[in-house]
């Protein structure tokens, strides 16, 4: 057989026995001569190129470049490949010699004690137990212990080859502590040496670099990269690093095994690459490869090296951010810089601190933006090393889709007395203000549900055929007033009013407001009734802890069974056919209330009294009366709003002022609160008494001092008090000039 590629000038060495395989008997002499065209050498089994006593290599007597290999009294262990080759080349000729020794069919290893086979528990991997044979066609099986198991070649994955040994899937013997080969010759069993089975792992689960990304340094700083390989047990790992400047003087590599918890099914290996003072040439890709022999995994990271610390805003930094109320707003601080800058956000000059509604970090996040978040936000970047600062202003504009104030106040089922004039109002708040508010209407019976129409709690009116209020034929005569603008609760609102000249037919009215970010609508159920009437005593809007009573008056000749109910806290569940006046047809949603019945000559009056009204008493109250003849139920609904108690406050300040004798002083003190506070004036801490020159008007709100005199000088206090306490403001009035002498002569 020939090994290697024939060179142009050299022929392969020629062996005296021109065979690939030679079979000889034990105890005979093996002699092979090799001839060639330059210096030759022999290699033989076991001692692959050493000087063994029994093997003799001699120069031929009959020519140059010729060597004879002689082994007297060969034994089975001499079985193997004999190779003649040119020195320092790959050119060689090989013959495989079997020394048939039936007493020792397996070739023993050099140590003749035991061998070691390394295996992995991989289903797809096979292992070769090197029990080579001195006879080519032996019947060989593999014995594994303990427990004892025998494996026989199956012509597939289990096989024996005299030149190679016994091949078997490694997982089949991974349980075993030792294996050996066994041959049967003439009913006699022969065993190879024992091989200890060592299970080695190969699996690498992952290779992690730390830091994993975004590594930035400036020239002269130390780079430390940790590469951690996590593997299965019984694995050895080789680390290999690739990096830009491989000739680095200050590079240090340290590899070590990391301790893992006992009972862990995993091993950890760490390789640390350290470069003490990086230079610009160290910038680039750093790759760590971990190899277990059967598996290699790698990970890379990019290291950026800056000339010096710096900070700057990125080109994508926004200057104007527009958002709609309720959205999450994210304003990232886009910067370039090393090291990462300290980032501080300010709103209208005030530092922002993170809380549950706002996160002020690399990204300014406002969880649910509201109008009060509108303003100028300044982000200041500070380089922690150089202390260089950069600032940028971002304007946040928060838009508000139209919100209709009455939507939350007025019940969707208010009833209106027949023939009365009524005003319906839509107060719209929107940013930017609505570009239009339109009114629509529809007859109530046209909007009664059909079984096919799905009705939701949020949209209890499934009506689609809205008509413009200009077309009021068949409905109530309508007039839409011009929009007005009002400052309500400190907000600029648009007020649109619709006047119904005479409430003759039950209808639904809808106002719709639209601006650039959305639309809002309010549907008003305008149910006209000739039935009972509700009045509130003593006041339309009581304050909490006050008493209020709802009076339901009905004509006794027409109605009977007056009953007061309160609508449940949930919006009304609307069922098929329940409009108009769904409350009357669904008493399940109502709470019956205790009330007192009174009568006069024509009417029954059912009075429901709320002593010490609370905010929980707010809601829709329903008076139900039954027609004496038809037994049809009539409902009237009235919404009760209970005002919260608010301690007195005084809006605006009293100003200190200087006035000349004889002039007038006019000051006002506007107080708010619930219940409305009483206003009192004091001068130098004594109650101010009205006289010809001191006039108090508008419930003491306005104080006028006519023809001031020197004695009017002093400290004036306006005090507003209610059961919830007092508020006060003070001002000093200075009176200048000399008092005129009164001529009494």
């Amino acid at each position: 057989a020939s090994v290697g590629l024939p060179s142009v000038s050299l022929d392969l060495p020629r062996l005296s026995i021109q065979k690939d395989i030679l079979t000889i008997k034990a105890n005979t002499t093996l002699q092979i001569t090799c001839r060639g065209q330059r210096d030759l050498d022999w290699l033989w089994p076991n001692n692959q190129s050493g000087s063994e006593q029994r093997v003799e290599v001699t120069e031929c007597s009959d020519g140059l470049f010729c060597k004879t290999l002689t082994i007297p009294k060969v034994i089975g262990n001499d079985t193997g490949a004999y190779k003649c080759f040119y020195r320092e080349t790959d050119l060689a000729s090989v013959i495989y010699v079997y020394v048939q020794d039936y007493r020792s069919p397996f070739i023993a290893s050099v140590s003749d004690q035991h061998g070691v086979v390394y295996i992995t528990e991989n289903k797809n991997k096979t292992v070769v137990i090197p029990c080579l044979g001195s006879i080519s066609n032996l019947n060989v099986s593999l014995c594994a212990r303990y427990p004892e198991k025998r494996f026989v070649p199956d012509g597939n994955r289990i096989s024996w080859d005299s030149k190679k040994g016994f091949t078997i899937p490694s997982y089949m013997i991974s349980y075993a502590g030792m294996v050996f080969c066994e041959a049967k010759i003439n009913d006699e069993s022969y065993q190879s040496i024992m091989y200890i089975v060592v299970v080695v792992g190969y699996r690498i689960y992952d290779v992690v670099l730390s830091p994993s990304h975004g590594i930035e340094l400036s020239v002269g700083e130390k780079l430390v990269l940790n590469c951690t390989a996590r593997t299965e047990l019984n694995v050895g790992i080789d680390f290999n690093w690739e990096y830009p400047s491989s000739k680095h003087q200050h590079k240090k590599l340290v590899n070590r095994d990391l301790k893992t918890q006992s009972g862990s099914e995993m091993k950890k290996f760490l390789s640390t690459l350290t470069i003490d003072g990086v230079t610009r040439s160290d910038q680039g890709l750093y790759t760590c490869a971990a190899s277990s022999g059967l598996m290699t995994k790698k990970n890379s990271t990019f290291v950026r090296v800056h000339e010096k610390p710096f900070v700057a805003f990125g080109s994508g930094m926004e200057s104007l951010v527009e958002a709609t109320v309720g959205e999450r707003v994210r304003i990232p601080a886009k910067y370039l810089g090393y090291p990462p800058p300290e980032i501080k956000w300010y709103k209208n000059g005030i530092p922002l601190e993170s809380n549950h509604t706002i996160k002020a970090g690399h990204v300014l996040t406002i969880m649910e933006v509201s109008e009060r978040d509108t303003g100028n936000y300044t982000v200041i970047l500070t380089n922690p090393i150089s202390k260089e600062k950069q600032s940028h202003v971002v304007s946040l504009v928060v838009y508000v889709p139209p919100q209709i104030g009455e939507k939350s106040l007025i019940s969707p089922v208010d009833s209106y007395q027949y023939g009365t004039t009524q005003t319906l109002t839509c107060t719209v708040y929107a940013i930017p203000p609505p570009h239009h508010i339109h009114w629509y209407w529809q007859l109530e019976e046209e909007c009664a549900n059909e079984p096919s129409q799905a009705v939701s709690v949020t949209n209890p009116y499934p009506c689609e055929e809205w008509r413009s209020v200009e077309d009021f034929q068949g409905g109530n005569k309508i007039e839409v007033n011009k929009n007005q603008f009002a400052l309500i609760e400190g907000k600029n609102k648009t007020v649109s009013t619709l006047v119904i000249q005479a409430a003759n037919v039950s209808a639904l009215y809808k106002c719709e407001a639209v601006n650039k970010v959305g639309r809002g609508e309010r549907v008003i159920s305008f149910h006209v009734t000739r039935g009972p009437e509700i009045t509130l005593q003593p006041d339309m809007q009581p304050t909490e802890q006050e008493s209020v009573s709802l009076w339901c008056t009905a004509d006794r000749s027409t109605f009977e069974n007056l009953t007061w109910y309160k609508l449940g806290p949930q919006p009304l569940p609307i069922h098929v056919g329940e409009l108009p006046t769904p409350v009357c047809k669904n008493l399940d949603t109502l709470w019956k209330l205790n009330a007192t019945m009174f009568s006069n000559s024509t009417n029954d009056i059912l009075i429901m009294e709320l002593k010490n009204a609370s905010l929980q008493d707010q809601g829709d109250y329903v008076c139900l009366a039954q027609d004496r003849k038809t037994k049809k139920r009539h409902c009237v609904v009235r919404q009760l709003t209970v005002l919260e108690r608010v301690a007195p406050t005084i809006t605006g300040n009293l100003e200190n002022q200087t006035t000349s004798i004889g002039e007038s002083i006019e000051v006002s003190c506007t107080a708010s609160g619930n219940p409305p506070p009483q206003i009192m004036w004091f001068k130098d801490n004594e109650t101010l008494v009205e006289d010809s020159g001191i006039v108090l008007k508008d419930g003491n709100r306005n104080l006028t001092i006519r023809r001031v005199r020197k004695e009017d000088e002093g400290l004036y206090t306006c005090q507003a008090c209610s059961v919830l306490g007092c508020a006060k403001v003070e001002a000093f009035f200075i009176i200048e000039g000399a008092q005129e002498k009164t001529n009494l002569e």
């Epitope: 009045t535 005593q537 003593p538 008493s547 007192t596 006069n600 009075i607 009294e609």
Partner: nanobody, 124 residues
């Protein structure tokens, strides 16, 4: 200073009658609405009858309708409650009440002024 002074209370057998009077001082009964309340032992005070400003309309609780009559004498500035066919459940302290012109004082929250009360006891 407004004062309401009740009189006419006392003990009576079931089925008997009593007439309560309420004299108002510092307050015009013709220009305001007036009423009568009662409070039985262990119960809340309840409206019994009312009369509006000018005496054109009278109001009664269901429990006394047809048995009690409210009236007023503007000249004497007095309000009366005529109680007929009295029952043991009518036993209570009866209070005179004054309200604004409207509504009549049929419930406590619209009462502006109260009298001291007079005891009525009906035995079976």
């Amino acid at each position: 200073q407004v004062q309401l002074q009740e009189s006419g209370g006392g003990s009576v057998q079931a089925g008997g009658s009593l007439r309560l009077s309420c004299v108002a001082s510092g307050y015009s009964v013709s220009k305001n609405s007036m009423g009568w309340f009662r409070q039985a032992p262990g119960k809340e005070r309840e409206g019994v009858a009312g009369i509006n400003e000018g005496g054109t309309a009278t109001y009664y609780a269901n429990s006394v309708k047809g048995r009690f009559t409210i009236s007023q004498d503007n000249a004497r500035n007095t309000v009366y409650l005529q109680m007929n066919t009295l029952k043991p459940e009518d036993t209570a302290i009866y209070y005179c009440a004054a309200g604004s012109p409207d509504p009549p004082p049929l419930i406590e929250s619209v009462v502006k002024y109260w009298g001291q009360g007079t005891q009525v006891t009906v035995s079976s």
